[in-house]
Amino acid sequence: LTCLGGFASPGPVPPSTALRELIEELVNITQNQKAPLCNGSMVWSINLTAGMYCAALESLINVSGCSAIEKTQRMLSGFCPHKVSAGQFSSLHVRDTKIEVAQFVKDLLLHLKKLFREGQFN
């Protein structure tokens, strides 16, 4: 019974699984892109280092009405330890250039693939 209970109510998703699922979602977005992603919306680019997940969420959360990235927004919130709302930028987030969401997703995907290969799951 204990075993079945554990099966029915799984614990937290392992970081490696969560990262792989995020990568899969970003791959899905880039491959299924017909028209310009999010109508060509532009977001603040991010420094792909410390605090990357929160920074990515801070950028993408400002884009509304774009169903293609809603799942990504939800997944990124699982990697960010604090609540992020639109218009909120941490001190780590240097706003120096805006890029199209499609480019943002491609850049993020390349970096996450690199982290996954290197075994950096957090």
Epitope: N39, G40, S41, V43
Partner: nanobody, 116 residues
Framework: EVQLLESGGGLVQPGGSLRLSCAAS????????MDWVRQAPGKGREWVSS????????WYADSVKGRFTISRDNSKNTLYLQMNSLRAEDTAVYYC?????????WGQGTLVTVSS
Amino acid sequence: EVQLLESGGGLVQPGGSLRLSCAASGFTFRDYEMDWVRQAPGKGREWVSSIGPSGSETWYADSVKGRFTISRDNSKNTLYLQMNSLRAEDTAVYYCAKAYTGFGYWGQGTLVTVSS
């Protein structure tokens, strides 16, 4: 319905100046960050500058820093871009945009041509 109407473009010699304007309607202008984006012939869209809702925060692409100034008049629902020391590489169609909304909410653009 969001409407953005740019004006002020034209032909100017290198080193010259132009002031672009963008009249906004259909949304509460003072509540939104606004962008200027440009597209040179045969190239992709390039972000130029952004301004926060109150106008106190501004950001610029490295390529225009020190030459362009973004501003806004919330009482007139108008966005501006003062462009000085213009170069041939500034030749493009300039669009004003409600930030984060995509080109479904952009204006029709105004053409800036820098040539001698």
